[in-house]
């Protein structure tokens, strides 16, 4: 997978998400998540994988909200 620079792409975001991943990450690969800062130009949910990668996702995608619910419940 192509890794984009930390401040501009969906991988390894530092503060804000500037683009979102275009694929659905398998649930079993995700360990944690956090929301980007509300001051960012666009909202983002950052999923942290078991390998330590951080991936920017679109909060409006159903699978993203489903994963958040699942992690909150567990």
């Amino acid at each position: 997978t192509k890794t984009e620079s930390s401040s501009r792409g969906p991988y390894h975001p530092s503060e804000c998400c500037f683009t979102y991943t275009t694929y659905k990450i398998p649930r079993q690969r995700i360990m944690d998540y956090y929301e980007t800062n509300s001051q960012c130009s666009k909202p983002g949910i950052v999923f942290i994988t078991k390998r330590g990668h951080s991936v920017c996702t679109n909060p409006s995608d159903k699978w993203v909200q489903d994963y958040i619910k699942d992690m909150k419940e567990n």
Epitope: T19, E35, N58, S60, D61, K62, Q65, I68
Partner: antibody, heavy 120, light 106 residues
């Protein structure tokens, strides 16, 4: 299943707009609500949305002066927009989606809209 | 931000004819595109999502196609009831709508 916006009306510049979206026939715990507006003779413009778990997100232009909240007991979602200008004159729609179309921004339940006019 | 540019209005077609409305995105949106129909004084109605999938209850004469940055809504066997404004929506990035294209049925 339906959604309905509260009455709009005439506002003065710098006023604060408060609109309520009342939903019927479905639960806010399984649906997201979007707010979209349409200036006279113009295209649709997204304002923001609140997820089925109650988190609100906003378009970049609207973020600094918009707040979306919900009351699950009353099945209502409220849009508050501050510092109105003439450019905010538009028909305001609320729209619901349950993610059936893979994304909560894709809405299949729309209210009739309510006209908001900002003029001194 | 993504910019969606639609076919200029109005687009005219005879009853029974074919109408094509184009929507061009300023960057690739991976088929995360919906089409809405809006009649005067009414709210939008969802027609198509994921660029080509018909929403529930939408007649099969409506067809969506395209990928990358170029998308098309085609209406075959146009009926009087199809006179409306058609708008595209991208939901890959920032939830942007096109400016709308008015379809006139003669």
């Amino acid at each position: 299943q339906s959604v309905k916006e509260s009455e709009g009306g005439l506002f003065k510049p710098a006023d604060t707009l408060t609109l309520t979206c009342t939903v019927s026939g479905f639960s806010l715990s399984s649906y997201a609500i979007n707010w979209v507006r349409q200036a006279p003779g113009e295209g649709l413009e997204y304002i923001g949305w609140i997820s089925d778990v109650g988190t609100a997100y906003y378009a970049s232009w609207a973020k600094s002066r918009s707040t979306i909240t919900r009351n699950t007991d009353e099945n209502t979602v409220t849009l508050k927009m501050t510092s109105l200008t003439a450019a905010d004159t538009a028909t305001y729609f609320c729209a619901g989606g349950d993610g059936s179309y893979s994304n909560y921004w894709v809405s299949d339940i729309w209210g009739q809209g309510t006209l908001v006019t900002v003029s001194s | 931000a993504v910019v969606l540019t639609q076919t200029a209005s109005p687009v005219s077609a005879p009853v029974g004819g074919t109408v094509t409305v184009k929507c061009q995105a300023s960057q690739t949106i991976n088929s995360r595109l919906a089409w809405y129909q809006q009649k005067q004084g009414q709210p939008p109605k969802l027609l198509i999502y994921e660029a080509s999938t018909l929403a529930s209850g939408v007649p099969s004469r409506f067809k969506g196609s395209g990928s990358g940055t170029e998308y098309t809504l085609t209406i075959r066997g146009v009926e009087c009831a199809d006179a409306a404004t058609y708008s595209c929506q991208e939901y890959a990035d920032e939830n942007i709508f096109g400016g709308g294209t008015e379809v006139v049925v003669k």
